[in-house]
Interface confidence: medium
């Protein structure tokens, strides 16, 4: 069937359109184009005779039409009046005619739109704004954009006038945005420039910063005021209702108690005509005096005296605080606070109570600290220590002994030999000693303030022959795989070599054996039961040598995993069950049995006469070593077969 296709269907003014003919019949004589939906000679545009290839313009020809041999019609430089229907009349050789109608629409190219507004400075929560998209254009669609996005759904937004007008009711500061309008028709789309809506708002209730309302006398007061507002607010300050200045910040240096009062900030928006105020109450406190500590005893004696520390001055309705060693007071039965916390009493002072101590007075703003106070606790003397620790010396050497005892004030020292006073010095020196210098050497320490004295006695032996040494131990019953043992060869002697033997042989090389203190101390780390041997130490010098008696190490170990014997697990009914449990352990362990989880007797041997299949089950032996604190156990299954059945069958 003959059809006409318009390419394009929607045509912009000034462009061209092609009326394309489809299914043109064969054996044609010619054809003619007409404006409109029917063949009308008055509205003929152009005719075409195929045989002569002659095109003849008609009354409706405008000079912009071109006809092609395939009957298609091109119309150039389209104008608005070209809109409508076009009819093709085809004359065939048999003089039978055919007709077909096509159409197209003409639209103008849209100009760039612009936005007009009925209110350039609307007031928040009061005014409405109507935006209109200009110009008004026929057959155009109007669209709106807010911040380059399509319009949000809002009851305050209304489109009217064919969407050409956008009205914002009761504008808010959040409506301050970029607005654009767009016009569209089938052949073009144009978007306007942005219009920024300038909403007047505020001022909101001002905020005064900083928030603190308490100040100390002598500080600077610096208050700042801010209120959200468009245009920006103008600020005024009032103190106790009296106008001060028209600034956003209020600064008063070196304030006094007289500056206490109500501070009002007023924000004013000249465009909206609105005022808002905020009031803050400022309190200025007088500077309290710096506290100090008094003591009822400046030189207390350890374990005898109490000390009462008092925080001065006494101020009514004040909180007193205490610190010891820069920390809050520890909980101690020896520390007592008075009801008002002003007095801290130390009962039965010790040398560790020296401090420093601080007290504080708390006011509304801060805590004022006193200077630290140190207690001078009188103590000691403790038992004196005589050094060096040697007790054996060879003739001809110099004897130099020093004595020290912890004491406050420092102790005064005296030396006695065999009870006879020698000298009042901390050190005792005797040159080129002989065997006659052997004896009891006593150091006496005296504290003149407390009146206390303490003594220590040391036996000094001067001999060319070395004494028989002995072995001391720091642990007489070490636990296997847990404890270490340190053997020390006594006595400590100058210019002496120390030697060790284990089971009569020199020390084996082992990472668990360590010699120290000039080989005088032998340490066994992580002892094992194999360390239970005879240990001998020896001393020698250029003149003589001697060995100690052997010391046998008693290592506590076990209990190891026990063994239940006999190993049989199958028995015949009627037999006697006699199970023995053994575990390697030092000391010997305690034994107990459980059958099927039920505790039985506390013996090494479990005996059950004439067993039956009821005696089937689990037999557990438990071993416990009270010395090592360790336990162990083993479980064994026993199967009792009825007489005459083969072992291993279950009951």
């Amino acid at each position: 069937k003959l059809t006409i296709e318009s390419t394009p269907f929607n045509v912009a003014e000034g462009k061209e359109v092609l009326l394309l003919v489809h299914n043109l019949p064969q054996h044609l004589f010619g054809y003619s184009w007409y404006k409109g939906e029917r063949v009308d000679g008055n509205r003929q545009i152009i005719g075409y005779v195929i045989g002569t290839q002659q095109a003849t313009p008609g009354p409706a020809y405008s000079g912009r039409e071109i006809i092609y041999p395939n009957a298609s019609l091109l119309i150039q430089n389209i104008i608005q009046n070209d809109t409508g229907f076009y009819t093709l009349h085809v004359i065939k050789s048999d003089l039978v005619n055919e007709e077909a109608t096509g159409q197209f629409r003409v639209y103008p190219e849209l100009p760039k739109p612009s936005i007009s507004s009925n209110n350039s400075k609307p007031v928040e929560d009061k005014d409405a704004v109507a935006f209109t998209c200009e110009p008004e254009t026929q057959d155009a669609t109007y669209l709106w954009w807010v911040n380059n996005q399509s319009l949000p759904v809002s009851p305050r937004l209304q489109l009217s006038n064919g969407n050409r007008t956008l009205t914002l009711f009761n504008v808010t500061r959040n409506d301050t945005a970029s607005y654009k309008c767009e016009t569209q028709n089938p052949v073009s789309a144009r978007r306007s420039d942005s219009v920024i809506l300038n909403v007047l708002y505020g001022p909101d209730a001002p905020t005064i910063s900083p928030l603190n309302t308490s100040y100390r006398s002598g500080e600077n007061l610096n208050l700042s005021c801010h209120a959200a507002s468009n245009p920006p607010a103008q600020y005024s300050w009032f103190v106790n209702g009296t106008f001060q200045q028209s600034t956003q910040e209020l600064f008063i240096p070196n304030i006094t108690v007289n500056n206490s009062g109500s501070y009002t900030c007023q924000a004013h928006n000249s465009d909206t005509g609105l005022n808002r105020t905020t009031v803050t109450t400022i309190t200025v406190y007088a500077e309290p005096p710096k506290p100090f500590i008094t003591s009822n005893n400046s030189n207390p004696v350890e374990d005898e005296d109490a000390v009462a520390l008092t925080c001065e001055p006494e101020i009514q309705n004040t909180t007193y605080l205490w610190w010891v060693n820069n920390q809050s007071l520890p909980v101690s039965p020896r520390l007592q606070l008075s009801n008002d916390n002003r007095t801290l009493t130390l009962l039965s002072v010790t040398r560790n109570d020296v401090g420093p101590y601080e007290c504080g007075i708390q006011n509304e703003l801060s805590v004022d600290h006193s200077d630290p106070v140190i207690l001078n606790v009188l103590y000691g003397p403790d038992d004196p220590t005589i050094s060096p620790s040697y007790t054996y010396y060879r003739p001809g050497v110099n004897l130099s002994l020093s004595c020290h005892a912890a004491s406050n004030p420092p102790a005064q020292y005296s030396w006695l030999i065999d009870g006879n006073i020698q000298q009042h010095t901390q050190e005792l020196f005797i040159s080129n000693i002989t065997e006659k210098n052997s004896g009891l050497y006593t150091c006496q320490a005296n504290n003149s303030a407390s009146g206390h004295s303490r003594t220590t006695v040391k036996t000094i032996t001067v001999s060319a022959e070395l004494p028989k040494p002995s072995i001391s131990s720091n642990n007489s019953k070490p636990v296997e795989d847990k404890d270490a043992v340190a053997f020390t060869c006594e006595p400590e002697a100058q210019n002496t070599t120390y030697l060790w033997w284990v089971n009569g042989q020199s020390l084996p090389v082992s990472p668990r054996l360590q010699l120290s203190n000039g080989n005088r101390t032998l340490t066994l780390f992580n002892v094992t039961r194999n360390d239970a041997r005879a240990y001998v130490c020896g001393i020698q010098n250029s003149v003589s040598a001697n060995r100690s008696d052997p010391v046998t190490l008693d290592v506590l170990y076990g209990p190891d995993t026990p063994i239940i014997s006999p190993p049989d697990s199958s028995y015949l009914s009627g037999a006697n069950l006699n199970l023995s449990c053994h575990s390697a352990s030092n000391p010997s362990p305690q034994y107990s049995w459980r059958i099927n989880g039920i505790p039985q007797q506390h013996t090494q041997v479990l005996f059950i006469a004439k067993i039956t299949p009821n005696n089937n089950g689990t037999y557990a032996c438990f071993v416990s070593n009270l010395a090592t604190g360790r336990n162990n156990s083993i479980v064994k299954s026993i199967t009792v077969s009825a007489s005459g059945t083969s072992p291993g069958l279950s009951a």
């Epitope: 099927n596 989880g597 089950g617 689990t618 083993i634 479980v635 279950s650």
Partner: nanobody
Framework: QVQLVETGGGLVQPGGSLRPSCTAS????????MGWYRQASGKQRELVAL???????NYADSVKGRFTISRDNAKDTVYLQMNSLKPEDTAVYYC????????????????WGQGTQVTVSS
Amino acid sequence: QVQLVETGGGLVQPGGSLRPSCTASGSIFSIYAMGWYRQASGKQRELVALITRDEVFNYADSVKGRFTISRDNAKDTVYLQMNSLKPEDTAVYYCWVETVNDHYNSGVEDYWGQGTQVTVSS
């Protein structure tokens, strides 16, 4: 610790059957024996049946031929098939597990369940 969860107790008529089960969970190195004990009101706890890892069984005389104990080692679960139940079987039935905690069979420990009530009554 080892936790034991017992299920399957309840009320049954004389001559009826029940099959309670008990599942062990927690730090089990090796379960050696699993079993059931019971305690009737006013009486001492007594062994009902047990089964060891090496298939040693033990039954109380009063349940032989009626009760069968079985064990699923993979699930650490023990079952007690109770047939031909009698009123004197009424008791709280406790699951019992015996564990060993190292390769040398040393360190034996017992664990007990909370108990499940079995009531045989017409």
